[in-house]
């Protein structure tokens, strides 16, 4: 029951995460005009991965696609690639995980096959989440660099009478959507990997053996059976579990390296 819940929850969390990654990739507000110097601007600029937009205070919004591939910054291309890879892996992961769900019966699919599919989809979700987090973080880093560069430019060459205000860009809503969505996909993937362990059949399943002693009829059940039911202690099983817990921690701590970029 707990395995089914973990798998189901992992699937739902990943589904929300991937929907968020798709939404973030399509959103126009990856970077928005910084209004610190001019909060009452009549023209507001914002940019996405695919087009840049201008919203006028009159209510009109005009968006223009980036109709060039070669003319775009390499970093932007890299972010696009990371987000698309994340979406593709996530979509495949979702497809695989649907068939892997314990609550769905497809023919006579064995638990071992479902366990493998669950693990595969979990890994795909983890990589998908990491791709999204990496993509958003690369873009955020690019924004921070450009922000401080334009700030430096803003305060140079002001000796003349005419001021040219440089437009600075700051974090847009899509970045936060992307970070949260990537995190959710990652968590969903970890949950699927945890569920996979519960689905996998045990390596040692000893059947109950009856020994007929002279004059007595005693049914002797070896300790191995006791362990295989999931109760009691089995050092081998415990070791696998502990190792799994460490891997889970490592996976969860790894993306946080990108969070502050």
């Amino acid at each position: 029951m707990a395995v089914t819940a973990c798998q189901g929850l992992g699937f739902v969390v990943s589904l929300i995460g991937i929907a968020g990654i798709i939404a973030a990739t399509c959103m126009d507000q990856w970077s928005t005009q910084d209004l610190y110097n001019n909060p009452v601007t009549a023209v507001f600029n914002y940019q996405g991965l695919w087009r840049s937009c201008v919203r006028e205070s009159s209510g009109f919004t005009e968006c223009r696609g980036y109709f060039t591939l070669l003319g775009l910054p390499a970093m932007l291309q890299a972010v696009r690639a990371l987000m698309i890879v994340g979406i593709v892996l996530g979509a495949i992961g979702l497809l695989v995980s649907i068939f892997a769900l314990k609550c769905i019966r497809i023919g006579s699919m064995e638990d071992s096959a479902k366990a493998n599919m669950t693990l595969t989809s979990g890994i795909m979700f983890i990589v998908s989440g990491l791709c999204a987090i990496a993509g958003v973080s690369v873009f955020a880093n690019m924004l921070v660099t450009n922000f401080w560069m334009s700030t430096a430019n803003m305060y140079t060459g002001m000796g003349g009478m005419v001021q040219t205000v440089q437009t600075r860009y700051t974090f847009g809503a899509a970045l936060f959507v992307g970070w949260v969505a990537g995190g959710l996909t990652l968590i969903g993937g970890v949950m699927m990997c945890i569920a996979c362990r519960g689905l996998a059949p045990e390596e040692t399943n000893y059947k109950a053996v009856s020994y007929h002693a002279s004059g007595h009829s005693v049914a002797y059940k070896p300790g191995g059976f006791k362990a295989s039911t999931g109760f009691g202690s089995n050092t081998k099983n415990k070791k696998i579990y502990d190792g799994g817990a460490r891997t889970e921690d490592e996976v969860q701590s790894y993306p946080s390296k990108h969070d502050y970029v």
Epitope: N38, V43, N45, V54, S57, S58, G59, F60, V165
Partner: antibody, heavy 118, light 113 residues
């Protein structure tokens, strides 16, 4: 076709409050910003206030923002400018205009002349 | 606030003349997002409301005769009437539409010579 018409008192006393109404037709308010502009006799145009297309934002001339309030009434297709503490220097022809592409004012009302005198 | 300075304040010309009015802003009106200059030109006749001629510094409003043209970028702009017609004698205003407050120029009165 697009029409805008300003209405309000022609004469107000100093310190009184002026309420000007701009009634428009021929377009939906949500798609366009609306502005108030005034012109003192023999002088240049002076922008006063704007309310954005969605109605979420209002903008005022800094020196007058404490006395001016721009608002809208969607049901009546009206934009209202309220000016408190009127002064003889506020004597002018007041225009309302529709703000369109490029933030330019493409349609104007005929204007209403307001005289501030005791 | 962005200051708008128009010159000349008065201009005497004859029908058929080529007329040029200049407008200078204290800050650039060029928006980097769409590479458009947020400068607008209006025509006003005595006792009437202003009429929009040109927006985005060079885009002619529909119904405006082709003899009116706008040019310039950044802080220096020009309104040109290629061949002055009797109907063109009026006062012309430029306006900053880039940043609030939306300031107007002092106006240029085009009168008959």
């Amino acid at each position: 076709q697009v029409t805008l018409r300003e209405s309000g008192p022609a004469l107000v006393k100093p310190t009184q409050t002026l309420t000007l109404t701009c009634t428009f037709s021929g377009f939906t308010f949500s798609s366009y910003g609306m502005s108030w502009i005034r012109q003192p006799p023999g002088k240049a145009l002076e922008w006063l206030a704007t309310i954005s297309g969605g109605g979420s934002y209002t903008y005022y001339l800094d020196s007058l923002k404490d006395r001016f309030t721009i608002s809208r009434d969607i049901s009546k297709n009206q934009v209202v400018l309220t000016v408190t503490n009127m002064d003889p220097a506020d004597t002018a022809t007041y225009f309302c205009a529709r703000q369109s592409r490029g933030n330019a004012m493409d349609y104007w009302g005929q204007g209403t002349t307001v005289t501030v005198s005791s | 606030d962005i200051q708008m300075t128009q010159s000349p304040s008065t201009l005497s010309a004859s029908v058929g003349d080529r007329v040029t009015i200049t407008c200078k802003s204290s800050q650039s009106l060029l928006n980097s997002g769409n590479q458009k200059n947020y400068l607008t030109w209006y025509q006003q006749k005595p006792g009437k409301a202003p009429k929009l001629l040109i927006y985005w510094a060079s885009t002619r409003e529909s119904g405006v005769p082709s003899r009116f043209s706008g040019s310039g970028s950044g802080t220096a702009f020009t309104l040109t009437i290629s061949s002055l017609q009797p109907d063109d004698f009026a006062t012309y205003y430029c306006q900053n539409d880039y940043s609030y407050p939306l300031t107007f120029g002092g106006g240029t009165k085009v009168e008959i010579k």
